[in-house]
């Protein structure tokens, strides 16, 4: 049940964290004017990665999309990259994992199948998320950088008469949206990948027997699976329901075996 | 059409308060900003206040803050102007104005009312 | 607060020639984000309240004349009537529309020499 529950949660988390993703990279408010200098300005400017807007205080609002490709910034066009990199990573994960939920039956699915589509989604989703957190960070350091250049160039005198604010620009809101998203989504792939431990049935059908360093004593396994051979009925390591109690070892050396039916 | 009609001037002695009114019409009051600009007899104009369709944020220049209030009902299609601590300086003709969409410009204004500040 | 300098103060014309108002703020009224220039001009004659001529220093209200016209960017600015009218005797402001206080130039009496 708990690796269902984990499972279940990761990509709930997971769903959460993409859309989050999805919504940063759509969002105009990457970075926002500073207001520090000039509180009472009639005109807002913000930016985000495909356009830039601005906003006067009547409430109209024009933005202007970014239609060069070439002559945009090399920073702004590796953000870009990792944050479509991570939607579509995300997505492909979002995918496999409804695939993979243990509360979906496709067909005769084995668990080993659903525990490897679980593990991929997981990986997925963890490189979406790192892909998230990482341009959303760069965009960030970009941010700091063009801040403090310009606070250094805050007023250029034009002929010891004339001063020219430069506008700076703070953090957005995308970009804390794009931290928690891309976290959200890191969280969901280490649940997943954590779930996928409980799914995964053991490597060799061989378990009847444990061993113990310290005595002599044998714990013969109560059924389960069909020992000895390995030829029988259940070849390919099903679980047989076994109503019988456990040693304390077994419970201690195979802790997620028994979780399901 | 649109229309702004001011009332509420008058003589009053310094130190003391009034309150004008514009009255709205034409056009869909509360989607637009509002300000006051006023000119003094002979001189140049003065912008006074702003407030936005919303209410908030509002504006003012130096002179005047602390001393005057603008407010707006948008179901009364009024805007208002309160002045206290009135002084000499600030005997004007008052003007309503509305805030254009775009532009930051003031697109329609009002007839004016005289406020005479004197003792 | 940006303080805004128009000349001159009085400026005779005569009919059918063209008129330049100048401006200058003390600060740049172009706002980076989109290339736009805060600046307003209006014209009031006499006994009559301000009417809106241009905003965005060139982009002219609808209804005003194309004798009219608007330049200038970042801190000076000018107004051009290219060809003088009977009716364009007025006063004329140019208002900074980028920052609060918004603040009108001292005017400029346009007359017929």
């Known amino acids: 049940m708990a690796v269902t529950a984990c499972q279940g949660l990761g990509f709930v988390v997971s769903l959460i964290g993409i859309a989050g993703i999805i919504a940063a990279t759509c969002m105009d408010q990457w970075s926002t004017q500073d207001l520090y200098n000039n509180p009472v300005t009639a005109v807002f400017n913000y930016q985000g990665l495909w356009r830039s807007c601005v906003r006067e205080s009547s409430g109209f609002t024009e933005c202007r999309g970014y239609f060069t490709l070439l002559g945009l910034p090399a920073m702004l066009q590796a953000v870009r990259a990792l944050m479509i990199v991570g939607i579509v990573l995300g997505a492909i994960g979002l995918l496999v994992s409804i695939f993979a939920l243990k509360c979906i039956r496709i067909g005769s699915m084995e668990d080993s199948a659903k525990a490897n589509m679980t593990l991929t989604s997981g990986i997925m989703f963890i490189v979406s998320g790192l892909c998230a957190i990482a341009g959303v960070s760069v965009f960030a350091n970009m941010l700091v950088t063009n801040f403090w250049m310009s606070t250094a160039n805050m007023y250029t005198g034009m002929g010891g008469m004339v001063q020219t604010v430069q506008t700076r620009y703070t953090f957005g809101a995308a970009l804390f949206v794009g931290w928690v998203a891309g976290g959200l989504t890191l969280i969901g792939g280490v649940m997943m990948c954590i779930a996928c431990r409980g799914l995964a049935p053991e490597e060799t059908n061989y378990k009847a027997v444990s061993y113990h360093a310290s005595g002599h004593s044998v714990a013969y396994k109560p059924g389960g699976f069909k020992a000895s051979t390995g030829f029988g009925s259940n070849t390919k390591n099903k679980k047989i329901y076994d109503g019988g109690a456990r040693t304390e070892d077994e419970v201690q050396s195979y802790p997620s075996k028994h979780d399901y039916v | 059409e649109v229309q702004l009609v001011e009332s509420g001037g008058g003589l009053v002695q310094p130190g003391g308060s009034l309150r004008l009114s514009c009255a709205a019409s034409?056009?869909?009051?509360?989607?637009?900003?509002m300000h006051w600009v006023r000119q003094a007899p002979g001189k140049g104009l003065e912008w006074v206040s702003y407030i936005t369709s919303g209410e908030s944020p509002i504006y003012f220049t130096d002179t005047v803050k602390g001393r005057f209030t603008i407010s707006r009902d948008n179901a009364k299609n009024s805007l208002y102007l309160q002045m206290n601590s009135l002084r000499a300086e600030d005997t004007a003709v008052y003007y309503c104005?509305?805030?254009?969409?775009?532009?930051?410009?003031?697109?329609?204004w009002g007839q004016g009312t005289l406020v005479t500040v004197s003792s | 607060d940006i303080v805004m300098t128009q000349s001159p103060d009085s400026l005779a014309v005569s009919l059918g020639e063209r008129a330049t108002i100048n401006c200058r703020s003390s600060q740049s009224l172009l706002n980076a984000g989109n290339r736009k220039n805060y600046l307003t001009w209006y014209q009031q004659k006499p006994g009559q309240p301000p009417k809106l001529l241009i905003y965005w220093a060139s982009t002219r209200e609808s209804g005003v004349p194309d004798r009219f016209s608007g330049s200038g960017s970042g801190t000076d600015f000018t107004l051009t009537i290219s060809s003088l009218q009977a009716e364009d005797v007025a006063v004329y402001y140019c208002?900074?529309?980028?920052?609060?206080?918004?603040?009108f130039g001292g005017g400029t009496k346009l007359e017929i020499k």
């Open positions: 034409g056009f869909t009051f509360s989607t637009f900003g």
């Open positions: 208002q900074n529309a980028y920052s609060y206080p918004f603040t």
């Open positions: 104005a509305r805030s254009s969409y775009y532009g930051q410009s003031m697109d329609y």
